[in-house]
Interface confidence: low
C-alpha cells in the first residue's frame, strides 16, 4: 500500500508568492510558492495519485504583514482552502498568546491541529479542550494512518503560551500515544512536530511504532540529486535514521517559508512497516501556475493589507537616525529602539530567580537602512518601518558563550572606519572600544546587564558563561562576517518579523523618544 | 535508550585526585547536558555539576575549587575529576542526563547505575 | 543554594495506604520541582518533573502537586515495589539541590 505525503512546514505567513529569497517579491515572472501555486500543485497530485495527505509542521504564524493584520485568521481560512490534512502547533503559534491561537485558528480550522506534549491545565483545561488534539486517525483510502503531534518543548521560552500550557519532553510525551494508537489496530504512524531536525531525528530513533516523521523549525533543506535553487540539503531526502529497534525510519522536512512542498513516497507492507520511501522537495517556482480561484481570494484579503500599511503606528518626538554615516560608526538611537523592541519583544513569564530569560541585543549597523524624520507629525507606519527593516528578516533567539561574543565585538571595528555594515548596534550591553590598539583587540570593556538578578545591573562579560542574545537572522546565519556566530552558536531559534517586533513596540509605547546615551563608547 | 555506565577506581588515597568516566551508549553525547551526583553512604544526594555535549560546564560552589568536567565526544564519554580527596569524598558516584536542555527545566534522567568510591589509606 | 526540606524524614506505612510526602524550598522555584525514588544499592529513579508531570512509565498512582515553595508527592495506594526512598529536586536554579529524602517503610 503506497501513501504519498505532502508536506509544509514553517511557511511564516508567505501567503502571497515571494522573491527566491522568501522576501516580497518584485520580479513576478521569477516568484515562487505563495499558497496559489500551492494549491496547484496539490491538486496536480491529488488527481495523479490516491492516496495523499497534506500536512504542515507548524510555524503558519510570524513572519508577514498578513499576520500584523488577520492575526491567524489567513491561516486558518487559506489551510481550509487548500484541504490541509492535519497540522502540528509549532511555537510561533503562541505568539499572540493562547486567545490568539484559540479564536482565529484552532476554532476556524476544518483540519486536525496537533500536539502530543501541550497539556492545559488550570482553567484553560476545560476551554480549549477537543480544540487540539494529541492525535488524530485519517482515513486513506482503503487504509487508516494516525498523525501523532509534537512542539518544540522549549516554547516557553520562544512564545508567548502563558502558564497554563506545560511543555513536555517530546520523546516522553510521543510513546503512550503512539502506544494508544497501536492498541487501535493502527499501524501506519507518522509523527508531525515542530522541534526542529535534531528531536526529529531523535524521535524516529526513540519512539517504538513511528513509521515517519515529518518535521520544521529547524528550516532544513534536505535533497537527493542536484537542488533546484539556492539551498544547500543538509542530508539526503528522505533522512533515513535507524531505529533503537532496528527499523529505518524515513524523516523529512521542506526548508521553510512556503518554496517547496515536501513530496514523500511511502510503500507500507500489510502489517504497516515501511517497505520503501523515496521523494524530494518540489520547488514551487514560476513553472506552476497560480490557481485563479485562490490568487482571487489573496487579491480581496490584500486590500486591507495596503491599507494598513500607511495607518499611524505611534509618533516620534525625535528623529530616529538611522543612516548609515551614524549607525555604522557610532551608537545610533535608531539602533537603540529596535534593540530595546527586541527585547521588550522577548520578555517572557519570569521566575524569582530572573526578571527575564534575555537581556541582550545586538544588531549589525548595515542593516539599519533608513532613518525616520520626526518632522512629518512625527508619524511612524509600517511603511516607514519597511524602509528601515526592508530585508524581511527575524529578529532570533542564540545561546553564545562570552567569549564568542567577545569575537563578534572585534570583528564589529576589526576595520573601522570604511562605512561597512558589521559595526553593532546594541541593547543590554555597554561595549568601550580603542581603535588605537590593533585589528582583534580593541574591545577594552564589555559589560552585559544580568539576567538573574532583582535589578538589572551590568557585569563584566564571563567568558566561559553562557548568554542569551537576540539578534538578526542574518547575523545568526553568519552575515555581514560574522562566521564566529554561525559556528560557536549552542542554540538558534528563529524569532519575529523584524518590522513586525518594531511595529508592536511603537504601538505600545505610543509615543517613542530614543536617545543615544553610551551604550557605545570610544576611549 | 541511552544508557550511561560509571568506570573508575573504588579506591583512592586521601589528598589523591579521584577519576571517574562515564560512557554514554545508545545515543549522542552532544546535544544534552551530563551531570555528576554523589551519595554518601546512607545519606542524602549532592549535585557536583554539569558539562554540556559541546563543553561548557557548571559546578556547585561548594566543590567548584576541586573540580574539573570535561567530554570526549569521540569516544561518547565525559568525565569527572575531584582533587585533594578525604574521607568525606567517600560516596557513590553516579552519571546523569539532564532530561531536557532547557536551563530553567533539568531533571535527571536516564542515571548510571553508580559506582562507589572510598577515600582511605 | 537554595535549601531543600522534605518531611516526614520517614513513614511507615501500609500495603494500601495512601502516603503524602512534602517538600519545601528555601526560596520560589515556581513549578520546576522533581521527584524521585531510589531502592537500596540502586539509582533513583524520576518519577514526577515540573511539579506535577508522570514521567513516561511511572504508575498513576504517584501524583505530584504545588508551586512556589510547597510541594507535595502522593501515592494513592502503596504497592509493595513502592517501598523506598523519596528524593526531591530543585531544577529552578544552580546549584541544583536535593531534599533529605523521605524513607517509607513496611509499617
Known amino acids: 500500500w503506497e501513501l504519498t505525503i505532502l508536506h509544509t512546514n514553517d511557511v511564516h505567513s508567505r501567503l502571497e508568492q515571494t522573491s527566491e529569497d522568501s522576501s516580497k517579491c518584485v520580479n513576478a515572472s521569477r516568484c515562487m510558492g505563495g499558497v496559489a501555486r500551492l494549491f496547484t500543485k496539490v491538486q496536480q497530485i491529488r488527481r495523479a495519485e490516491p492516496n495523499v495527505l497534506l500536512l504542515d509542521a507548524g510555524d503558519q504564524y510570524q513572519g508577514t504583514i498578513w499576520f500584523t493584520v488577520y492575526k491567524g485568521a489567513e491561516v486558518a481560512h487559506f489551510m481550509n482552502a487548500l484541504r490541509y490534512d492535519a497540522m502540528a502547533l509549532g511555537n510561533h503559534e503562541f505568539d499572540n498568546g493562547v486567545e490568539g491561537l484559540i479564536e482565529p485558528l484552532l476554532k476556524e480550522a476544518k483540519f486536525p491541529i496537533l500536539s502530543a506534549n501541550i497539556k492545559a491545565k488550570g482553567p484553560l483545561a476545560s476551554q480549549i479542550s477537543g480544540l487540539y488534539l494529541p492525535y488524530k486517525v485519517l482515513p486513506v483510502g482503503d487504509e487508516v494512518v494516525g498523525i501523532v503531534g509534537y512542539t518544540s518543548k522549549e516554547t516557553p521560552f520562544l512564545s508567548n503560551p502563558g502558564t497554563n500550557l506545560v511543555f513536555e519532553d517530546e520523546i516522553t510525551a510521543l510513546q503512550p500515544e503512539v502506544d494508544k494508537l497501536k492498541t487501535l489496530n493502527v499501524n501506519k504512524i507518522i509523527a508531525l512536530g515542530h522541534s526542529g531536525f535534531e528531536t526529529d531525528k531523535l524521535i524516529a530513533q526513540k519512539v517504538r511504532g513511528v513509521d515517519v516523521v515529518v518535521g520544521g523549525h529547524s528550516n532544513t533543506f534536505l535533497y537527493t540529486g542536484n537542488p533546484p535553487s539556492k539551498e544547500v540539503p543538509a542530508g539526503k531526502y528522505p533522512f533515513i535514521v535507524t531505529s533503537d529497534d532496528g527499523r529505518k525510519v524515513p524523516v523529512v522536512q521542506a526548508y521553510a517559508f512556503g518554496k517547496y512542498l515536501g513530496y514523500l513516497k511511502i510503500e507500507f507492507d500489510e502489517r504497516g512497516n515501511v517497505i520503501s520511501s523515496h521523494g524530494n522537495p518540489i520547488l514551487l517556482n514560476s513553472s506552476i501556475p497560480e490557481d485563479p480561484s485562490i490568487k482571487a481570494d489573496i487579491n480581496k484579503w490584500r486590500i486591507k493589507l495596503d491599507n494598513y500599511s500607511t495607518q499611524e503606528l505611534g509618533k516620534t518626538i525625535v528623529y530616529l537616525d538611522g543612516s548609515s554615516q551614524s549607525c555604522r560608526f557610532r551608537e545610533c538611537n535608531m539602533g537603540n529602539l529596535i534593540c530595546d523592541a527586541m527585547i521588550n519583544n522577548n520578555l517572557r513569564h519570569a521566575d524569582e530567580m530572573f526578571w527575564n530569560h534575555v537581556s541582550m541585543c545586538i544588531l549589525n549597523g548595515g542593516g539599519i537602512r533608513s532613518p525616520i524624520d520626526e518632522r512629518n507629525n512625527g508619524t511612524i507606519t509600517w511603511e516607514n518601518l519597511a524602509a528601515v527593516l526592508p530585508f524581511g528578516g527575524t529578529f532570533d533567539l542564540v545561546q553564545l558563550k562570552g567569549s564568542t561574543l567577545k569575537k563578534a565585538f572585534e570583528h564589529s571595528v576589526h576595520r573601522y572606519g570604511q562605512s561597512t555594515g558589521e559595526f553593532l548596534q546594541v541593547g543590554g550591553i555597554h561595549v568601550v572600544y580603542d581603535l588605537s590598539r590593533k585589528p582583534g583587540d580593541r574591545v577594552v570593556k564589555l559589560d552585559v546587564l544580568c539576567t538573574k538578578c532583582r535589578v538589572p545591573s551590568y557585569d563584566p562579560l564571563k567568558m566561559d558563561e553562557i548568554y542569551k542574545v537576540i539578534l538578526p537572522n542574518f547575523l545568526a546565519n553568519g552575515g555581514d562576517g560574522f562566521q564566529m556566530i554561525k559556528d560557536e552558536l549552542l542554540r538558534h531559534d528563529s524569532g519575529d518579523q523584524d518590522i513586525n517586533v518594531v511595529s508592536t513596540y511603537i504601538s505600545k509605547m505610543k509615543v517613542i523618544y530614543p536617545a543615544v546615551e553610551g551604550r557605545i563608547k570610544f576611549s | 535508550q541511552v544508557q550511561l555506565q560509571e568506570s573508575g577506581p573504588g579506591l583512592v588515597k586521601p589528598s589523591e585526585t579521584l577519576s571517574l568516566t562515564c560512557t554514554v551508549s545508545?545515543?549522542?553525547?552532544?546535544?544534552?547536558?551530563w551531570s555528576w551526583i554523589r551519595q554518601p553512604p546512607g545519606k542524602g544526594l549532592e549535585w557536583i555539576g554539569y558539562?554540556?555535549?559541546?563543553?561548557?560546564?557548571n559546578y556547585n560552589p561548594s566543590l567548584k575549587s576541586r573540580v574539573t568536567i570535561s567530554v570526549d565526544t569521540s569516544k561518547n564519554q565525559f568525565s569527572l575529576k575531584l582533587s585533594s580527596v578525604t574521607a568525606a569524598d567517600t560516596a557513590v558516584y553516579y552519571c546523569?542526563?539532564?532530561?531536557?536542555?532547557?536551563?530553567?527545566?533539568?531533571?535527571?534522567?536516564?542515571w548510571g547505575q553508580g559506582t562507589l568510591v572510598t577515600v582511605s589509606s | 543554594d537554595i535549601q531543600m526540606t522534605q518531611s516526614p524524614s520517614s513513614v511507615s506505612a501500609s500495603v494500601g495506604d495512601r502516603v503524602t510526602i512534602t517538600c519545601r524550598a528555601s526560596?520560589?522555584?515556581?513549578?520546576?520541582l522533581a521527584w524521585y525514588q531510589q531502592k537500596p544499592g540502586k539509582a533513583p529513579k524520576l518519577l514526577i518533573y515540573a511539579a506535577s508531570s508522570l514521567q513516561s512509565g511511572v504508575p498513576s498512582r504517584f501524583s505530584g502537586s504545588g508551586s512556589g515553595t510547597d510541594f507535595t508527592l502522593t501515592i494513592s495506594s502503596l504497592q509493595p515495589e513502592d517501598f523506598a526512598t523519596y528524593y526531591c529536586q530543585q531544577g529552578n536554579s544552580f546549584p541544583r539541590t536535593f531534599g533529605g529524602g523521605t524513607k517509607v517503610e513496611i509499617k
Open positions: 526560596q520560589g522555584i515556581s513549578s520546576w
Open positions: 558539562i554540556y555535549g559541546r563543553g561548557s560546564t
Open positions: 545508545g545515543g549522542s553525547i552532544e546535544r544534552y547536558y
Open positions: 546523569a542526563r539532564e532530561s531536557q536542555e532547557s536551563p530553567y527545566n533539568n531533571w535527571f534522567d536516564p
